[in-house]
C-alpha cells in the first residue's frame, strides 16, 4: 500500500509566440482545480477507460480574474497535494493523466460551469520510494509544471511497496537473518510470510505463503518475464522456462473486483470497471466525497457524505458518465421526425424542419391550404405537407396568379397551329390529321381514326380543346 | 475509418448528363444520423453546395436552388455508395465534384470526411 | 455567387495570431450554427470548426471559432507556417434552404 503524490507548480502560458488568452475575465471570473488518473503499466488508453490504479481531484484555485490587456500570466493554484492512495503493489511502471478545469463563476443557471482547459498525458517508470519526479507537459498553448512521486504507507517498503517493516522488538539489532529497515534504520524487515522463495522485486504477497506477481512477470515465484510470443494454448504453455502464462485458473476467476466491480481479461492481467464511487486496481478505493465536487459540467452530487459511502452525479441535460464528464450525443436519441434534422446547439437541441412541417421536434404536419387562397379559381390541394394549387385554365404559378400561356407547351401534333381560346386552347390541324391535339391521321379514303367526327365539325376544321 | 471514394468520368459533352458515384467504406448510407452531400468548387463560383440525401426512416433529399430543376441524388444501399446526376450540363459546370458526409451527430451541417474530388470538364 | 462575404487575404508571420471574419445575413449566419474548413491547393477541404466553436478532435487548438450576430469569426493564434491554406466559413440558410459557404480567405505567413 501507498501514496502517489502530485505537486502542481504552475499552470500558465507556454514559451513562444501565441500565448493563450486568459481562461478568466472580468466578466466571468473563474477558478482552476485539477484532475489526476493513473493506470498501471504503460498503457495508451483513451482518456475515458477507468483509472485503474486511482485517481483524485484538488481543491478549487483562488478566484482568478483578468487584468484587462494583460497576457494571461501563471494562474492561481489550489493549495496541497493530489494524492492518489494505492492498496497493491506500486506497479513500477504508470500512465498518467492530468487534467487542468476552469470552474466559471459568473451567473450560471444552474451553478458553475466547469469545461476542461488542458489535458496532458504521459508514461513514466517510478520507484517508490523515490525522490521527487519533476516533469514539464504541454498542451497546446498551455504549459504545466509538476512534481511527482510514490510513497510507500508502513509497513511497506521498497520500490514496489511490498516488503513488510515492523519496530524492532531489541534496542540493537533486528532478529535472526532480517536487515534493518532502510531508509528506516529503527525498523527491521518483517518475517517473511510469502511463499518461500517468491522474488522480492517481482512477487508480493497479501496472504501468508502466497505469490502473487507484479505485471509483466510470472511462474509459480515471479521469476519468470512474461513474453507473448510462443505461447501456444489460450493462456500459454505450461513450461516455465518459455515465459508464458501458466495455463489455469483465468485472472478473473473468483472475481477480484470488489465492490461490484466487473472483471474483465486484459493480455497480461485484469482490469476492473468499478461503479460510482470506487476505484483502484480492484475497485478497492472509495475516498471521493461530494465535498470533492466529484461531478462535472453542472452536476448534482448526491450522497457520498463519508468516504465509505458511493456518491451519484446527476448530470444536467446533454451531460453523461459516472462523472457527467462525458458530453452525451443527445441527436443520436434521433428526436426530430418527419426527415428534419437534429442540431445540438450545447445549450439547446433544435430540429430543423423540412418545408411542410413544425413544432419542437417537427411533429406537426403544416395544413399549408388554412388561409392560403388559390387565385383566379384555383383549388388547393395538400400532399406530402406541401401546399399546392390546381389552377383553372389559362392559369399557372403556385397561386395561380401568373397567366398561363396554354400554347407554351407546343401542344398540337403534327404541326397543328394551337390558339390561346379564353377556356383553353385550339389546335388548327395540318392536312391529313384531326382531333384536339391533332393527334390522329385522316385515312386517305376520307375515312378518319376516329368513329365520326362530331357533328358540325368536318375533319380538319380547329379542334377546341375543353 | 471513414472514406469516401469518388468515381465517374472527367469529361463530359454539352447537354448530356454528369454521373457520379461516391462510394462509403467504414460507414453506411443508410446510417440514420448522417447526410450524405455532394458539393462542387470553381474559380467563378467558389465552394456551392448542390443537395444531399439521407435516411431518416425513408430517404429524403434536398437540392440547390441553382440546379434543382436538373439534378438527382440517389443512394445505393446495397453497393453503399451514393450518386450525383447532372442533367443538361453546359460548360458553366465545369468544376471540381466533391462528395462529402455531415457526420458529426448534433451537427449535420458540418462536413467532416470529404472525397478526394473529381475534376470535370464540360466541354464538346 | 457566395452568399457569405470574407476578406480575400489575411497575413501574419510566425506567433501572431489571425482572425479572420464571415458576414451574412439573419436566415444563415444569424440563425444557423456556423462551420469553418482549410484548403490547401488540389486537396479537399478539412472541416476545422463546427456549431461556431467546437474543434475536430486533431484540430490543434491555436484554432478557436465565434459567432456574433450574423457574423462569424475564426482565430488562429500562434500562426505557423503550415497554416498557409484557403479558409472558408459556411452556414445552412433558412430562405434559399441549402448550405452557403463563404468567398474564402487566403491566410499567408510571412517569414
Known amino acids: 500500500a501507498g501514496v502517489f503524490e502530485l505537486q502542481i507548480h504552475s499552470f500558465g502560458p507556454g514559451p513562444g509566440p501565441g500565448a493563450p488568452r486568459s481562461p478568466c475575465s472580468a466578466r466571468l471570473p473563474c477558478r482552476l482545480f485539477f484532475r489526476v488518473c493513473l493506470k498501471p503499466g504503460l498503457s495508451e488508453e483513451a482518456a475515458e477507460s477507468p483509472c485503474a490504479l486511482g485517481a483524485a481531484l484538488s481543491a478549487r484555485g483562488p478566484v482568478y480574474t483578468e487584468q484587462p490587456g494583460a497576457p494571461a500570466p501563471d494562474l492561481p493554484l489550489p493549495d496541497g497535494l493530489l494524492q492518489v492512495p494505492f492498496r497493491d503493489a506500486w506497479p513500477g511502471t504508470f500512465s498518467f493523466i492530468i487534467e487542468t478545469w476552469r470552474e466559471e463563476l459568473g451567473d450560471q443557471i444552474g451553478g458553475p460551469a466547469w469545461s476542461l482547459l488542458a489535458r496532458v498525458a504521459g508514461r513514466r517508470r517510478l520507484a517508490a520510494g523515490g525522490p521527487w519526479a519533476r516533469d514539464i507537459q504541454r498542451a497546446g498553448a498551455w504549459e504545466l509544471r509538476f512534481s511527482y512521486r510514490a510513497r510507500c504507507e508502513p509497513p511497506a517498503v521498497g520500490t514496489a511497496c511490498t516488503r513488510l517493516c515492523r519496530p524492532r522488538s531489541a534496542p540493537s539489532r533486528c532478529g535472526p537473518g532480517l536487515r534493518p529497515c532502510a531508509p528506516l534504520e529503527d525498523e527491521c524487515e518483517a518475517p517473511l510470510v510469502c511463499r518461500a522463495g517468491c522474488s522480492p522485486e517481482h512477487g508480493f504477497c497479501e496472504q501468508p505463503g502466497e505469490c502473487r506477481c507484479l505485471e509483466g512477470w510470472t511462474g509459480p515465484l515471479c521469476t519468470v518475464p512474461v513474453s507473448t510470443s510462443s505461447c501456444l494454448s489460450p493462456r500459454g504453455p505450461s513450461s516455465a522456462t518459455t515465459g508464458c502464462l501458466v495455463p489455469g485458473p483465468g485472472p478473473c476467476d473468483g472475481n477480484p473486483c470488489a465492490n461490484g466491480g466487473s472483471c474483465s481479461e486484459t493480455p497480461r492481467s485484469f482490469e476492473c470497471t468499478c461503479p460510482r464511487g470506487f476505484y483502484g486496481l480492484r475497485c478497492e478505493v472509495s475516498g471521493v466525497t461530494c465535498a470533492d465536487g466529484p461531478c462535472f459540467n453542472g452536476g448534482l452530487c448526491v450522497g457520498g457524505a463519508d468516504p465509505d459511502s458511493a456518491y451519484i452525479c446527476h448530470c444536467p441535460p446533454g451531460f453523461q458518465g459516472s462523472n457527467c464528464e462525458k458530453r452525451v450525443d443527445r441527436c443520436s436519441l434521433q428526436p426530430c421526425r418527419n426527415g428534419g434534422l437534429c442540431l445540438d446547439l450545447g445549450h439547446a437541441l433544435r430540429c430543423r424542419c423540412r418545408a411542410g412541417f413544425a413544432g419542437p421536434r417537427c411533429e406537426h404536419d403544416l395544413d399549408d391550404c388554412a388561409g392560403r387562397a388559390c387565385a383566379n379559381g384555383g383549388t388547393c390541394v395538400e400532399g406530402g405537407g406541401a401546399h399546392r394549387c390546381s389552377c383553372a385554365l389559362g392559369f399557372g404559378g403556385r397561386d395561380c396568379r401568373e397567366r398561363a400561356d396554354p400554347c407554351a407547351a407546343r401542344p398540337c401534333a403534327h404541326g397543328g397551329r394551337c390558339y390561346a381560346h379564353f377556356s383553353g386552347l385550339v389546335c388548327a390541324c395540318a392536312p391529313g390529321y384531326m382531333g384536339a391535339r391533332c393527334e390522329f391521321p385522316v385515312h386517305p379514303d376520307g375515312a378518319s381514326a376516329l368513329p365520326a367526327a362530331p357533328p358540325g365539325l368536318r375533319p380538319g376544321d380547329p379542334q377546341r380543346y375543353l | 475509418q471513414v472514406q469516401l471514394q469518388q468515381s465517374g468520368p472527367g469529361l463530359v459533352k454539352p447537354s448530356q448528363t454528369l454521373s457520379l458515384t461516391c462510394a462509403i467504406s467504414g460507414d453506411s448510407v443508410s446510417s440514420n444520423s448522417v447526410v450524405w452531400n455532394w458539393i462542387r468548387q470553381s474559380p467563378s463560383r467558389g465552394l456551392e453546395w448542390l443537395g444531399r440525401?439521407?435516411?431518416?426512416?425513408?430517404?429524403?433529399?434536398d437540392y440547390a436552388v441553382s440546379v434543382k430543376s436538373r439534378i438527382t441524388i440517389n443512394p445505393d444501399t446495397s453497393k453503399n455508395q451514393f450518386s450525383l446526376q447532372l442533367n443538361s450540363v453546359t460548360p458553366e459546370d465545369t468544376a471540381v465534384y466533391h462528395c462529402a458526409r455531415g457526420g458529426i451527430v448534433g451537427a449535420p451541417d458540418a462536413f467532416d470526411i470529404w472525397g478526394q474530388g473529381t475534376m470535370v470538364t464540360v466541354s464538346s | 455567387q457566395s452568399v457569405l462575404t470574407q476578406p480575400p487575404s489575411a497575413s501574419g508571420t510566425p506567433g501572431q495570431r489571425v482572425t479572420i471574419s464571415c458576414s451574412g445575413s439573419?436566415?444563415?449566419?444569424?440563425?444557423?450554427?456556423v462551420s469553418w474548413y482549410q484548403q490547401f491547393p488540389g486537396t479537399a477541404p478539412k472541416l476545422l470548426i463546427y456549431?461556431?466553436?467546437q474543434r475536430p478532435s486533431g484540430v490543434p487548438d491555436r484554432f478557436s471559432g465565434s459567432k456574433s450576430g450574423t457574423s462569424a469569426s475564426l482565430a488562429i493564434s500562434g500562426l505557423q507556417s503550415e497554416d498557409e491554406a484557403d479558409y472558408y466559413c459556411?452556414?445552412?440558410?433558412?430562405?434559399?434552404?441549402?448550405?452557403?459557404f463563404g468567398t474564402g480567405t487566403k491566410v499567408t505567413v510571412l517569414t
Open positions: 456549431t461556431n466553436n
Open positions: 439573419s436566415s444563415n449566419i444569424g440563425s444557423d450554427p
Open positions: 440525401t439521407y435516411y431518416r426512416s425513408k430517404w429524403y433529399d
Open positions: 459556411a452556414a445552412w440558410d433558412d430562405s434559399l434552404n441549402g448550405h452557403v
